[in-house]
């Protein structure tokens, strides 16, 4: 028998510093956790205690802290190349920047070989890229060899800017004749790594035939056997094990996201390649780890240009942005509206001739707007302005709806009118007329959204049966606010960019902007 | 880390006036809504006042209902509470505190203030 | 205002024991509830918030749920450093506090 350890990480995000144990700005050094630094330190502890090791990243480095928004994926390669991963897969986060933003800063300077199976090049980008992503990587660890092939989700051009010349394919119709080809070569030991999901990381467990282990991302599926070191409650045992339509044993695992913890599997195999055993658990990286003297230190160093890029100029604003407690809980207000329009504009995506974009929609808590802008400081508008705009370090995601959910949440928004509490609703792409006379659960008289398939958008009222993809704050996908009805009830969700990187980018990309108060938000005659 | 420092309490007379501060520090202060909350001796805890983050919203409880004045200076990243025309009745250890009840919540230690003749 | 009531408002437990404390509000809260544990001479700690969400750093053996008007804390296997007294809150309107709930050691 010979003994395997997989080491991964998953949907990190841009977390290289030590983060507070929700995966938000570290507040309290002796209770904050993961960080590169810190992982570093549990990594290298297990390289020399154990023979066989492997460490592996299932994709997402890219995006979610202001380490993204300066450096665009440069520490990505550098930190990663640091810890000596062994091999990543493309997540859909990758293809945030395009594809230059993940050529250049990624692609080119990675030491690891960085994997998808089911991306498919073609045009001019086909010679471009050639070789700079592989489907599959033969790895050599002690006497034996390992084959890592990857894959990505379907959805990325979705959820990501991977351009036209990207096509991106079924995992299992892309990833079968990959671990043929493996199997070809004599590797008798395959790894499945990628980015889908842990619905799609059982099916590839399931259905793809001589794939041994899979270790998934995307769905951040926290999976944990015995008593949970911290506030994530499991999905399942560590590793789950699907039962693959050959009658194997194939352990599934992930490892939550942020980089607070750190996956650990140990696979024995027989000599034929069969799995006899797996068994591990995510360790937790807190503070009873140390962080790693070297490699804060670089982090150090990188964090300097972060603290000067707060200060610079992304735009312009000609009016006053509103984001007061009495605007922003109480009534539309140009805060919100600009916001809203920035998270639409994040999410462009023309992938088909039939629909101007696949979503129109945007609701935001006011509650979440957390100052205003004043114009009249030269109409600057900073980073330093927008972190206190959104305090909290959220993404803004995509989900999918039913339009009787939706009528839910705006009757929430109101249900409790005029105590300044933050589930009041900012829109984008929505217009919404309200009646405070009537009691609550009964006040959305109108709710109009506006049409994704149409050449001229235009609005309509919104049908209880039909599904929309709407775009909002990660704390509302998870039924904050007393948002409960999204959570229970949204049929897929999708984790997005960095809230203030989203603004900031629409800012620098429209230069000079002047958000109004124009009629999204009504109030019918007589109550308000 | 984060610190809720109240000061300002001490012992006063029926009738008379008492002005509490909170310094705060190890977040951002101006982007959080601000409680008092206050517990006398050997009793339960009651809520007495909150206010926006931006200062544009003020709620009080009906037992301090015109007597007492929440606001902050977000410059000085500090909040205050004005009690005037104070009673026996408002006894109490009073706290400070972030965004109750939610993931933000955080209070101070508290400052003792004793109305008695 | 929203009244909140609690029961027991003292009882005693030994370490070990799975423990349960509910709060009844005088109408419907939806889920904005949360609990507390408060130690003598210190500040109240936020346990739970949103009937059922556990707090960063609380031990996992502290459990919320409910919605509406019934809420119930529970603590799976008390250890000797849950003997506190336990408030409800709701932020439904504005905030109103249970009695409290004395846990002591039997």
């Known amino acids: 028998a010979w003994e395997l350890t997989i080491l991964h990480t998953n949907d990190v995000h841009s977390r290289l510093e030590q983060t507070s144990e929700d995966s938000s700005k570290c507040v309290n050094a002796s209770r904050c956790m993961g960080g590169v630094a810190r992982l570093f330190t549990k990594v290298q502890q297990i390289r020399r205690a154990e023979p066989n090791v492997l460490l592996l990243d299932a994709g997402d480095q890219y995006q979610g802290t202001i380490w993204f928004t300066v450096y665009k994926g440069a520490e990505v390669a550098h930190f990663m190349n640091a810890l000596r991963y062994d091999a990543m897969a493309l997540g859909n986060h990758e293809f945030d920047n395009g594809v230059e933003g993940l050529i250049e800063p990624l692609l080119k300077e990675a030491k690891f070989p960085i994997l998808s199976a089911n991306i498919k090049a073609k045009g001019p980008l086909a010679s471009q890229i050639s070789g700079l992503y592989l489907p599959y990587k033969v790895l050599p660890v002690g006497d034996e060899v390992v084959g890592i092939v990857g894959y990505t989700s379907k959805e990325t051009p979705f959820l990501s800017n991977p351009g036209t010349n990207l096509v991106f394919e079924d995992e299992i119709t892309a990833l079968q004749p990959e671990v043929d080809k493996l199997k070809t070569l004599n590797v008798n030991k395959i790894i499945a790594l990628g980015h889908s999901g842990f619905e799609m990381d059982k099916l590839i467990a399931q259905k793809v035939r001589g794939v041994d282990v899979v270790v998934g991302g995307h769905s951040n599926t926290f999976l944990y056997t015995g008593n949970p070191p911290s506030k994530e409650v499991p999905a399942g045992k560590y590793p789950f094990i699907v039962t693959s339509d050959d009658g194997r044993k194939v352990p599934v695992v992930q490892a939550y996201a942020f980089g607070k913890y750190l996956g650990y599997l140990k696979i024995e195999f027989d000599e034929r390649g069969n799995v006899i055993s797996s068994h591990g658990n995510p360790i937790l990286l807190n503070s009873s780890i140390p962080e790693d003297p070297s490699i804060k230190a670089d982090i150090n160093k990188w964090r300097i240009k972060l603290d000067n890029y707060s200060t610079q100029e992304l735009g312009k604003t000609i009016v006053y942005l509103d984001g007061s407690s009495q605007s922003c809980r109480f009534r539309e207000c140009n805060m919100g509206n600009l916001i809203c329009d920035a998270m639409i504009n994040n999410n462009l995506r023309h992938t088909d001739e039939m629909f101007w974009n696949h979503v129109s929609m945007c609701i935001l808590n006011g509650g979440g707007i957390r100052s205003p802008i004043d114009e009249r400081n030269n109409g600057t508008i900073t980073w330093e302005n927008l972190a206190a705009v959104l305090p909290f370090g959220g993404t803004f995601d995509l989900v999918q709806l039913k339009g009787s959910t939706l009528k839910k949440a705006f009757e929430h928004s109101v249900h409790r009118y005029g105590q300044s509490t933050g589930e009041f609703l900012q829109v984008g792409g929505i217009h919404v007329v309200y009646d405070l006379s009537r009691k609550p659960g009964d006040r959305v008289v109108k709710l109009d959204v506006l049409c994704t398939k149409c050449r001229v958008p235009s609005y309509d009222p919104l049908k209880m049966d039909e599904v929309y993809k709407v775009i909002l704050p990660n704390f509302l996908a998870n039924g904050g606010d007393g948002f409960q009805m999204i959570k229970d009830e949204l049929l897929r969700h999708d984790s997005g960019d960095q809230d203030i990187n989203v603004v900031s980018t629409y800012i620098s990309k429209m230069k000079v902007i002047y958000p109004a108060v124009e009629g999204r938000i009504k109030f019918s005659t007589g109550s308000h | 880390e984060v610190q809720l420092v109240e000061s300002g309490g001490g012992l006063v007379q029926p009738g008379g006036s008492l002005r509490l501060s909170c310094a705060a520090s190890g977040f951002t202060f101006s982007s959080y809504d601000m409680h008092w909350v206050r517990q006398a001796p050997g009793k339960g805890l009651e809520w007495v006042a909150v206010m926006s983050y931006d200062g544009s919203n003020k709620y009080y409880a009906d037992s301090v209902k015109g007597r007492f004045t929440i606001s902050r200076d977000n410059s000085k990243n500090t909040l205050y509470l004005q009690m005037n025309s104070l009673r026996a009745e408002d006894t109490a250890v009073y706290y400070c505190?972030?965004?109750?009840?939610?993931?933000?919540?955080?209070w101070g230690q508290g400052t003792l203030v004793t109305v008695s003749s | 205002a929203i009244q909140m009531t609690q029961s027991p408002s003292s009882l005693s437990a030994s370490v070990g024991d799975r423990v349960t404390i509910t709060c009844r509000a005088s109408q419907g809260i939806s889920n904005y509830l949360a609990w507390y544990q408060q130690k003598p001479g210190k500040a109240p700690k936020l346990l739970i918030y949103a009937a059922s969400t556990l707090q960063s750093g609380v031990p996992s053996r502290f459990s919320g749920s409910g919605s509406g008007t019934d809420f119930t804390l529970t603590i799976s296997s008390l250890q000797p450093e849950d003997f506190a007294t336990y408030y409800c809150q709701q932020s439904y309107s504005t905030p109103h506090f249970g009695q409290g709930t004395r846990l002591e050691i039997k």
């Open positions: 505190a972030t965004e109750i009840a939610a993931k933000g919540d955080y």
